[in-house]
Interface confidence: low
């Protein structure tokens, strides 16, 4: 019996036309939301005039759908066992499941201030980057509705900039009608023990942002894994939202719908210092933000967002170390909240929940030249906003995998 | 390697006008974007005008706006600065920088750039 039903996983596990995967992987069967909270900055004038802690509320969530539009330029490559695909960005405002609307306004960082200073550090450069600053107006902080901070504003001091430039931000532009990829993964014809595991991203097996083995492309992109999941296995997954690969771990055993699931977790090690786990040294870019790569709990991904220096970390900077977090008031990180599983069915691979959780922060350095952050006396990681994008397996679906899999192993 | 070499510097009365030019040598001129500055004896070093690559957008400092225009010849390479109305404050060395950095996003000016000797402009009133 238990044979049959391997090879009967086996076959349906496979990604290609007619089989269980292969239909749910193009377009996914699950509501995937995206919830987002703001950090709204409480005392923007005392931070900027005395240097003092950030004082933050978040308010939230504001929900968006996510993850709704198929797959796009599927084509599969019988010569390597490979099926590559765009994955296309898409939102929408989920008005009943949000705290308020797209026209709510936040004081928060001004992004342009801050991305420019750091990028331009030379002295004469910042002489005229304080000089267009002054005449736009423009602050260490500004304040701008959510629509504007998500999906992207005209800026008024980069619009003053003499050069060909982007003028257009917002940290999540552009999002709507553009796409993730192209992905190269493997379809597990010749080999199931690779199915969905990444082959190559955007044409390479590497990344180009960290050094060593910090820049491979590992395993699958976590909406699947290779059938027949042992509690045991460190589950090795890229995420293209934080330019790296990571990994989860076994946690506890659930029940989700009547569905035996493994529970996977990101643990406190994956973000942990060198000196904590001597395997994060190459994701330690820097010695002066980073004390000489004895903070954690941060991922400087500047290299991956042309230069501007983003910061990624688990909301409220769950396991991050104290001094990343001291000039920030009004944090509260906890694990329940604000962590990062995947429920994965063991026999298919498939992942039927998953709650991925992570914080943006920009980081802000004191600068002489530049008048509205000349007062500051340290650097500050300030937290901008927070997400947790949620999937759960519908009831129809579950019902259905309950019968024709679970089902016949019990 | 870049060379930039400055020239219309000279003596003026109040009033008057002058034509600085810059040639540069060494690089594809027009992949970049050029800038004037200036500075007066016991000051620092200051932001004057700037040009882009395509010569399409330009950007003055408020005590020369209305008064300098600043303009490229790609086919040249030389970027200039028509500088009219001059008043005695105006009087300084005047410096153009080109950016070795630019890559065609975000503000190009990375790093400290290459400059040219100087040519100094005096104002009499």
């Known amino acids: 019996g238990d044979l049959l039903i391997q090879k009967t996983i086996k076959k349906q596990v496979v990604l290609e036309e007619g089989t269980i995967a292969f239909k749910n992987w193009v377009k996914t069967g699950t509501e995937v939301y995206r919830q987002f909270w703001i950090f709204d900055v409480q005392n923007p004038q005392e931070v900027m005039m005395n240097s003092s802690n950030i004082q933050v509320k978040q308010r939230g969530p504001y929900t968006y759908r996510v993850r709704f539009l198929a797959k796009e330029n599927v084509t599969q490559d019988a010569e390597d066992n490979t099926v590559s695909f765009l994955q296309p960005n898409g939102a929408i405002f989920e008005p009943s499941l949000s705290v308020g609307t797209e026209a709510d306004n936040f004081t928060v960082l001004n992004l342009a201030v801050a991305a420019a200073s750091h990028i331009y550090q030379n002295q004469f450069v910042q002489m005229i980057l304080n000089s267009l600053i002054n005449k736009s107006k423009s602050s260490m902080f500004q304040v701008r509705t959510l629509r504007e901070l998500l999906w992207g504003y005209r800026d008024p001091f980069l619009s003053l900039v003499p050069y060909p430039v982007t003028t257009t931000v917002g940290l999540f532009y552009p999002y709507n009608n553009t796409a993730d990829g192209v992905y190269k993964v493997f379809n597990g014809k010749d080999n199931i023990s690779k199915v969905a595991i990444i082959d190559t991203y955007k044409g390479k097996r590497n990344l180009s942002y960290w050094e060593s083995h910090c820049d491979m492309i590992n395993g699958t992109d976590a909406a699947s894994f290779p059938p027949f999941v042992e509690k045991s296995q460190v589950l090795q997954f890229f995420s293209s939202d934080i330019c790296r690969s990571i990994y989860a771990v076994f946690e506890s055993d659930v029940n989700l719908k009547g569905i035996p699931v493994y529970r996977f977790v990101l643990p406190s090690k994956a973000f942990a210092s060198p000196v904590e786990n001597p395997d994060n040294y190459c994701f330690c870019t820097e010695k002066i933000i980073s004390k000489n790569c004895t903070s954690y709990g941060v991922l400087d991904i500047s290299k991956c967002k042309e230069g501007r220096p983003v910061y990624i970390s688990l909301p409220h900077f769950l396991y991050a170390s104290p001094d990343v977090s001291e000039p920030i008031d009004g944090l509260n990180p906890n694990e329940e909240e604000h962590r990062t599983y995947l429920d994965i069915e063991p026999i298919t691979g498939f992942t039927l929940q998953f709650a991925k959780r992570l914080q943006v922060n920009l980081l802000v350095k004191p600068s002489e030249k530049i008048q509205v952050l000349k007062n500051l006396k340290r650097n500050y990681i300030v937290p901008i906003l927070w997400l947790n994008e949620t999937g759960t397996i519908g009831d129809e679906k579950a019902n259905m995998f309950r019968s024709q899999v679970t089902g016949k192993i019990n | 390697q870049v060379q930039l070499q400055e020239s219309g510097g000279g003596l003026v009365q109040a009033g008057g006008s002058l034509r600085l030019s810059c040639a540069a040598s060494?690089?594809?001129?027009?992949?970049?974007?050029m800038g004037w500055f200036r500075q007066a004896p016991g000051k620092e070093r200051e932001f004057v005008a700037a040009i882009s690559w395509s010569g399409g957008r330009t950007y003055y400092d408020d005590p020369v706006k209305g008064r300098f225009t600043i303009s490229r010849d790609n086919a040249k390479n030389t970027v200039y600065l028509q500088m009219n109305s001059l008043k005695p404050e105006d009087t300084a060395v005047y410096y153009c920088?080109?950016?070795?950095?630019?890559?065609?996003?975000?503000?190009?000016?990375?790093?400290?750039?290459?400059w040219g000797q100087g040519t100094q402009v005096t104002v009499s009133s």
């Open positions: 060494g690089r594809t001129f027009s992949s970049y974007a």
């Open positions: 920088n080109l950016d070795p950095e630019y890559s065609g996003t975000w503000n190009p000016w990375a790093g400290s750039g290459y």
